[in-house]
Interface confidence: low
């Protein structure tokens, strides 16, 4: 289902599509267009992912511009402000709603954007936790292709003092072509930490084909989340995780 | 002045291949969107194929599978790779700029495909 | 996909005449009409964009109205110059869709 009005109120059946009107061509000038999404059960979460093929006046955003709000309306949590040719992060809202407002000025156009909407699931049982010597970590699925709307978190936890090696046999996902170099995995991404997830220091981000090589873990804890959107499905990733112990805790033995 | 400039037409047979040019001059190429509209012998305007400033491509049913639309924006050119031509794709093709609407047009050029 | 349809298909005129064309939208389409002129062997040009608005360098005897599904091209005082065809056009959504045209013909 596509919606291309210029505002609407979606109480979400299925997934389906807003896009600012005429998209994928030049949409119009000064319009201010309003569109609530409204999950069906108090209870769930949106998530809505922008179509890579994103294109609105850049200028700082003061005169072509789509806002997201995290509830029924402009006075919503704030969740960003975008313009340019970079397509936005995927957002998943805190509740039942999200309010997106979209104004364009009276000159200077582009092809606009287009935003997919769902009902946001968390993977199936994704999570794992390993406290094992050695290990393998796959991507659900794996080598199958992964599904879509994926939030997994893989923690590995061993004694202090000791080395997790982590090393990827296998990693394919949906690459961001987007330059610089492809830096942003706004679409599918591995997040990995030396350490619990945004706690310890940030290792890398991942994506695409280009394996992330050889990782090393001195605090006891690696941590990776895998996040999907919706659209787009690769292998995804197997890596092998080994415990080294180290000089000090050999001293313990 | 903005221009666009039409070449690449011709007699070809059905099943046979053709590379459409559009050469644009007067503007700032990158920042358009661009379209291929054709229009058959005494016919209407039919949109055919657009692609996006950033390099997205759409296409008309009617030619999905067969017509590649392209851009170089270094050279400042559009092109449209017709293959598996029909008779049906006789026309006159014109390679437009989509600003508000399809703001700007050129001059046309004439594909015929008959055996 | 979204179904333009013109009419008349001709008519005939003097200069000087008011001239009224019709276009209808098989789906709602806002205000996102274009209308395009085109004279024999040449390529069309824009007149009217987002139903009402007059492209740059256009005469302003064109004019546009509507919103929805019915819109409407005047031209308030033919000239000899407005003998052509007149195409309607939605970029409401893709595929992008022309009416059939009018074709303005000398009485």
């Known amino acids: 289902f596509r919606n291309d009005k210029c505002g609407d109120t979606i109480k979400i059946e299925s997934p389906g599509y807003l896009t600012s009107p005429g998209y994928p061509h030049s949409y119009h000038p000064s319009e201010k267009c309003e569109w609530l999404i409204q999950a069906p059960d108090p209870y769930q979460r949106i998530m809505i992912n922008f179509n890579p093929h994103f294109d609105l006046e850049d200028r700082d955003c003061k005169y072509d511009y789509v806002e997201v709000f995290d509830g029924e309306n402009e006075n919503g949590h704030f969740r960003g402000k975008f313009c340019g040719k970079i397509a936005p992060p995927p957002v998943v809202s805190s509740g039942p709603f999200l309010f997106i407002k979209f104004v364009s000025d009276y000159e200077t156009h582009g092809a606009g954007f287009s935003i997919r909407y769902e009902i946001f699931k968390r993977g199936p049982e994704c999570s794992q936790n390993y406290t094992t010597p050695s290990g393998v970590i796959k991507s659900p699925g794996f080598p199958e292709k992964y599904p879509n709307s994926l939030e997994c978190t893989y923690i590995v936890f061993v004694p202090k003092m000791s080395e997790i090696i982590l090393e990827f046999e296998s990693f394919d996902l949906e690459p961001d072509s987007n330059p610089p170099g492809g830096m942003f995995c706004r679409y599918d991404r591995l997040e990995i930490w030396d350490g619990f997830p945004d706690v310890g220091p940030h290792i890398g981000r991942y994506c695409g084909q280009k394996t992330p090589g050889r990782i090393r873990s001195s605090s006891g804890i690696l941590s990776m989340v895998f996040y999907t959107d919706s659209a787009i499905a690769k292998e995804g990733f197997s890596a092998n995780y080994s415990v080294l112990q180290s000089s000090v805790s050999e001293d313990f033995k | 002045e903005v221009q666009l400039l039409e070449s690449g037409g011709g007699l070809v047979k059905p099943g046979g291949s053709l590379r459409l040019s559009c050469a644009a001059s007067g503007f700032t190429f990158s920042s358009y969107a661009m379209s291929w509209v054709r229009q058959a012998p005494g016919k209407g305007l039919e949109w055919v194929s657009s692609?996006?400033?950033?390099?997205?491509?759409y296409y008309a049913e009617s030619v999905k599978g067969r017509f590649t639309i392209s851009r170089d924006d270094s050279k400042n050119t559009l092109y449209l790779q017709m293959n598996s031509l029909k008779t049906e794709d006789t026309a006159v093709y014109y390679c437009a700029r989509v600003g508000t609407a399809f703001d700007y047009w050129g001059q046309g050029t004439l594909v015929t495909v008959s055996s | 996909d979204i179904q333009m349809t013109q009419s008349p298909s001709s008519l005939s005129a003097s200069v000087g005449d008011r001239v009224t064309i019709t276009c209808r939208a098989s789906?709602?389409?806002?205000?996102?009409l274009n209308w395009y002129q085109q004279k024999p062997g040449k390529a069309p040009k824009l007149l009217i964009y987002?139903?009402?608005s007059l492209q740059s360098g256009v005469p302003s005897r064109f004019s546009g109205s509507g919103s929805g599904t019915d819109f409407t091209l005047t031209i308030s005082s033919l000239q000899p110059e407005d003998f052509a065809t007149y195409y309607c056009?939605?970029?409401?959504?893709?595929?992008?869709?022309f009416g059939g045209g009018t074709k303005v013909e000398i009485k």
């Open positions: 056009q939605q970029s409401y959504s893709t595929p992008l869709t």
């Open positions: 987002a139903a009402s």
């Open positions: 692609i996006s400033r950033t390099g997205y491509t």
């Open positions: 789906q709602s389409i806002s205000s996102y």
